[in-house]
């Protein structure tokens, strides 16, 4: 099974997403019609056990020789993986302040719905993107970054806070997703699994990535992140998958190279500013939205989703030291991030492009099972 | 609005104690369950440094020069966040900073420790 390919005549060579249909009809994934990753039943914050099982064993995607992410999804062939018994990697601790609820964590207890009730909300993310089942949206526009290009002064503050690694973003960095969709970036932090297994959040056809960037917006409609937190839009996140090339990636490693500073959980650093977009893949007019959720407590949803259909590519050194260096609680790797794929329950995830169409030759005509939702079409 | 408050500065002798608490307020969201929480300080003339601070995983990471002084925790139910003081000496003299990494920094207005005797 691969991923749908677009025409060739395509000026960046194609795009793939993949979504649940709405109706709930027989195109929803199962576990029998997909390899995506299921959610192990009642633990829908475990990650690694519905982690596809021997996915590492997917045949490697070898870059094609051009630019940073010139590696699209639709280029990632997905497999039928054969079960895998090993139990995934616990990156779970115990609690230093005994049994406080709300010390959450990645793989274990407490469960993140008695964290924070929006856990268990109908419209969570991650999901699965499905490209036959994306809804192409000719509304949507090429994504808008303005002052992404930030100077070295002042510096900004890098923290391993135990789950992720972030940089705080200065005032400034403003987004639009479209004509009155305005947005201000606040931080970007990543995902990442450990030695030979992806650690992406998002996952197209059930492949999983190796890692996955986040840049988290606030809407100018708000002026702080609590007002905005359960409101529709109120929150944007700009979401990357990060593959293996064959160079180092400049850009990343003006952070990583900053990693062994901040080994230690809740340890920071001051970093250069450094341009931020060069973090992201070059092409903005292919994603894929949907409205979902927070990955992590406190799940608040009404967060849009723009996830890139370019990848962008680091060294397999580079993928190495972002899983392998910094340490979370209880004396454990920070390793394996990223949260299970949430049921989309109806939601349809829109592309930007045409990223359902297949043109291989055994497709006489292009098929689209969705119709665009968003306004103006 | 979430708008956090520290309290308890004041005077103190060296080698003295002194237990400074910083509270959340203005929203019905429990700031200090899903944020990691620091309190840096600032004394005059000198650039705002990071003393202690607890992450969301229950996670603590003090500076060395308060290591061993200085215990960080925190009360998610009375959202609040403690920074114990002990065996203080004339340099942790300074303004002392509540902050909490929620998606964005908040930060709070400071409050004065002069150690000294």
């Known amino acids: 099974q691969r991923l749908p390919r677009m025409q060739e005549d395509s000026p960046l060579g194609g795009g793939s997403s993949g979504e649940d249909d709405p109706l709930g009809e027989e195109d929803l994934p199962s576990e029998e019609d997909s390899p995506r990753e299921e959610d192990p039943p009642g633990e829908e914050d475990l990650p690694g056990e519905e982690d596809l099982p021997g996915e590492e064993d997917l045949p490697e995607v070898k870059p094609k020789s051009e630019e940073e992410g010139s590696l699209k999804l639709e280029d990632l062939p997905t497999v039928e993986a054969p079960g895998d018994p090993q139990e995934p990697q616990n990156n779970a601790h115990r609690d230093k302040e005994g049994d406080d609820q709300s010390h959450w964590r990645y793989g274990g207890d407490p469960p993140w719905p008695r964290v924070s009730p929006a856990c268990a909300g109908r419209f969570q993310s991650p999901v699965d993107i499905r490209p036959q089942l994306a809804a192409f949206c000719p509304a949507l526009r090429p994504l808008e970054l303005l002052g992404f290009q930030l100077p070295p002064l002042p510096e900004l503050r890098l923290r391993n806070n135990g789950h992720s690694v972030q940089l705080t973003l200065p005032p400034g960095l403003e987004m639009a997703l479209g004509p009155g969709r305005e947005y201000r970036a606040l931080q970007l932090h990543l995902h990442w699994g450990a030695a030979g297994r992806p650690g992406s959040e998002h996952t197209v056809e059930g492949h999983r990535f190796p890692a996955e960037i986040h840049v988290v917006h606030l809407s100018t409609a708000f002026a702080r992140v609590d007002e905005a937190l359960g409101r529709p839009g109120g929150l944007a996140v700009l979401a990357a998958f990060l593959e293996e090339g064959p160079e180092e990636n400049s850009a990343y490693e003006q952070l990583l190279s900053r990693l062994e500073e901040i080994a230690e959980e809740g340890s920071e650093t001051q970093v250069p500013g450094l341009d931020i977009s060069a973090l992201l893949p070059s092409d903005f007019s292919r994603y894929f939205q949907y409205e979902g959720s927070l990955t992590t407590p406190p799940c608040a949803q009404g967060v849009i989703w723009t996830v890139f259909n370019q990848t962008v590519m680091l060294s397999a050194k580079q993928l190495h030291t972002l899983s392998d260096t910094l340490w979370g609680p209880g004396d454990s790797r920070l390793q394996l991030n990223f949260r299970a794929t949430q049921p989309l329950n109806g939601r349809v995830i829109e592309a930007s492009f045409p990223a359902g169409v297949d043109s291989s030759p055994r497709a006489a005509e292009p098929v689209q099972l969705n119709s665009c939702l968003a306004a103006g079409d | 609005q979430v708008q956090l408050q520290e309290s308890g500065g004041g005077l103190v002798q060296p080698g003295g104690s002194r237990r400074l608490s910083c509270a959340a307020s203005?929203?019905?969201?429990?700031?200090?369950?899903?944020?990691?929480v620091a309190w840096y300080r600032q004394a005059p003339g000198k650039q705002r440094e990071l003393v202690a601070v607890?992450?969301?995983?229950?996670?603590?990471k003090y500076s060395d020069s308060v290591k061993g002084r200085f215990t960080i925790s925190r009360d998610s139910a009375k959202n609040t966040v403690l920074l114990q003081m002990n065996s203080l000496k004339p340099e942790d003299t300074a303004v002392y900073y509540c902050?909490?990494?929620?998606?964005?920094?908040?930060w709070g207005q400071g409050t004065q420790v002069t150690v000294s005797s």
């Open positions: 902050n909490a990494d929620y998606l964005q920094d908040y």
């Open positions: 203005g929203n019905s969201v429990n700031i200090f369950s899903f944020a990691a």
């Open positions: 607890i992450t969301t995983t229950g996670g603590t």
